[in-house]
Structure formats: C-alpha cells, structure tokens
C-alpha cells in the first residue's frame, strides 16, 4: 500500500491521543534505553510503511502484536485516514484470524514495540533544523 495520500495530521493526532499511551503501557517496566534503534524511516509515508510492517507482520520470536490495543488503534487510524487502505488489508486480516490466539509478551516483542515507538516518534517529529 502507498501511504502517500494519507491524512498525516489526523494520524498524528490519533497517535498522540491514544496509540502512544498504549505503546507506553505495553512497554511498562522496560527501560527506554534497553533497545538500540535497528529500524528507521525517512519521510511520513516511509514511516507508515515500516510501522505497518512491524505492527502487523509476524516476525521470528514475535507473532502476536496485531491483537494488541495499539495495533488495533493503528489499524483503525490507517483505515480511516488512508484512502483505500481497508481494501488492501482484507486478505491479511482473514489470514490472521486463522492463527492461534496466544498472548505472550516476549523480549523480542518488547524490542519490536520499542522500534515502533521510535518510528512513531520520527513520524511525528517537527521539521528538522535547516541542516
């Protein structure tokens, strides 16, 4: 999906009002410096691409993020504020329903959510100084 035509300010507002808090809740008890940055993004569409990938694509050691509160709110925000996003996600959602629903917070998941926090911060960053 091409995130170029999303309403970035509306997504930013959704992040600031709820998604950010849910990410903090998930990470509670974890030091903010515990994980180094291993993923970055270079503009708002790119950030959303990487956020979608980390939030909804199962990875080795962390297959369970899509059912978390922050993930569901992320999905809702993208569905509302990114034209045509919902249609592209129907097949992915059906595939996800077939997986086992076992809620385990692994260290790998914590690391992944830490990377998500970094990506969201970059998405919401103010304009950089004139370099």
């Amino acid at each position: 999906y091409d995130f170029t035509n999303c309403d970035f300010e509306k997504i930013k507002a959704a992040y600031l009002s709820t998604i950010s808090k849910d990410l903090i809740t998930y990470m509670s008890g974890t030091k903010s410096t515990e994980f180094n940055n291993t993923v970055s993004c270079s503009n708002r569409p790119h950030c959303l691409t990487e956020i979608q990938s980390l939030t909804f694509n199962p990875t080795a050691g962390c297959a369970s993020l899509a059912k978390e509160m922050f993930a569901m709110k992320t999905k809702a925000a993208l569905a509302i504020w990114c034209p045509g996003y919902s249609e592209t996600q129907i097949n992915a959602t059906q595939a996800m329903k077939k997986r086992r629903k076992r809620k385990v917070t692994t260290n790998k998941c914590l690391e992944q959510v830490s990377q998500l926090q970094g990506l969201w911060r970059r998405f919401n960053r103010p304009l950089l100084k004139q370099q």
Epitope: V39, S40, S42, N43, E50, R122, Q130, Q131
Partner: antibody, heavy 122, light 108 residues
Framework: QMQLVESGGGVVQPGRSLRLSCAAS????????MHWVRQAPGKGLEWVAV????????HYADSVKGRFTITRDNSKNTLNLQMNSLRAEDTAVYYC???????????????WGQGTMVTVSS | SYVLTQPPSVSVAPGQTARITCGGN??????VHWYQQKPGQAPVLVVY???DRPSWIPERFSGSNSGNTATLTISRGEAGDEADYYC???????????FGGGTKLTVL
C-alpha cells in the same frame, strides 16, 4: 548486535581500480542512509560519499566525484564503493557508517565499521 | 563549500571540565554531531543533534550550539577521554557531509 564489516582493501597501483564492500547485520539496512568516510594516515576524517536508504540518490565529495561510485544492495544488506583511477592521495582507512535520513537530510552516523586499509602505491 | 574549524588540541586536568569548540558560519542553524576517536579505532558518536546523547554515552558528555559556535563539554575528565574529537554537519546547500579538522584532547 548491530554491525558493519568492511572488506576489499589492499595495495593497488595508481590508476588502477578497487572495490570495497560493507556487510551490515543486526538492523534493518534498507531504512538507513549509508556513508563511506576515509582517514589518511595521521590525518582527520574525510567524508567520501553517501547513498539514500532506497538507493534513489547519491552524493560525493568533490575529491572523488567522477572516480568513485557508491552503490547498495538492500536484498543482500551490502554497501559498495567502486574506486577507479586511484591516486596516492586516496591512501586511507575507509569506514562505512549508517545514518538515519529525513527527507533529503542525513543525520548523525551512529554505527561505524572498523575500517579497511587502502594503499595506493607504485 | 562549508567549513568547520576546531582547535588542534585541548588539555584538561583529571576531574576538570574540557570544552572543545567547533566554528562555522551560522552554525546554530544546523544540527551538529560529535565523534570520539581513539588511536587505531573507528569513530564513536558521542553527541548528536547539538545536544542529544546516545544511550551508551555517559552523562559527562554534553553539547550546545548557537550563533557561529558549537561546543562539546566533557565534565569530570578522565584518562579514558583522551582521544580525537570531530564535529560534523550535513550541509544542505551543497548536499555534502562536512567534518571539522579534529581536536586532540589530552588529560594531563
């Protein structure tokens, strides 16, 4: 463990070519800008070139423009520097480094390799 | 092209504060990054975006940037801080990375 490992250095005669490689691991390579920086013996750091996170664009120092080419292969997590028409003044340790990028601005170089030595001598 | 100027050397007594400067035209409008390099080793990022510090760098390292000068401050200097220090910016007008000439810090 995030890591950059350079290879391909060696001794080469003036006017000849050499290709350096940098293997990345432990991070999502395709999301970072990548640089080559060099350091001549006893001298300071000199930036050589940078390639965008997606390979879309490249920038070069005037001292190497037209002679060096920076490329990347995001499917293999590798960065390359093709060095042609080498000169004695290209003798240096060559480091690769990663840099977060925002739009067309490159940020700090937060991870560096250990470097590979290139000696240009007849 | 854009030029960054650093003093070739700075000395500090153990436990005292060292300040390394980096000068450039209207430097305060740019984000400055600082690197530490010990002999035979690769550079290490110690301060980025003027004053932010990577998680692995001690709080003794801090930075500031305004006007035409950026400053790297190392408080409570230790023997292990002896190294070369380089400032760096991205020059958007020319799409080039620029490094300062480097400053050799000696802990007396």
């Amino acid at each position: 463990q995030m890591q950059l490992v350079e290879s391909g250095g060696g001794v080469v005669q003036p006017g000849r070519s050499l290709r350096l490689s940098c293997a990345a691991s432990g991070f999502t390579f395709r999301t970072y800008g990548m640089h080559w920086v060099r350091q001549a013996p006893g001298k300071g750091l000199e930036w050589v070139a940078v390639v965008w996170y997606d390979g879309y664009d490249t920038h070069y120092a005037d001292s190497v423009k037209g002679r060096f080419t920076i490329t990347r292969d995001n499917s293999k997590n590798t960065l390359n520097l093709q060095m042609n028409s080498l000169r004695a003044e290209d003798t240096a340790v060559y480091y690769c480094s990663r840099s977060p990028q925002w739009e067309d601005i490159f940020e700090s170089m937060d991870i560096w390799g250990q470097g590979t030595m290139v000696t240009v001598s007849s | 092209s854009y030029v960054l100027t650093q003093p070739p050397s700075v000395s500090v007594a153990p436990g005292q504060t060292a300040r390394i400067t980096c000068g450039g035209n209207n430097l305060g409008s740019k984000s400055v990054h600082w690197y530490q390099q010990k002999p035979g080793q690769a550079p290490v990022l110690v301060v980025y975006d003027d004053s932010d510090r990577p998680s692995w760098i001690p709080e003794r390292f801090s930075g500031s940037n305004s006007g035409n000068t950026a400053t790297l401050t190392i408080s409570r200097g230790e023997a292990g801080d002896e190294a070369d220090y380089y400032c760096q910016v991205w020059d958007m007008s020319s799409d080039l990375v620029v490094f300062g000439g480097g400053t050799k810090l000696t802990v007396l």
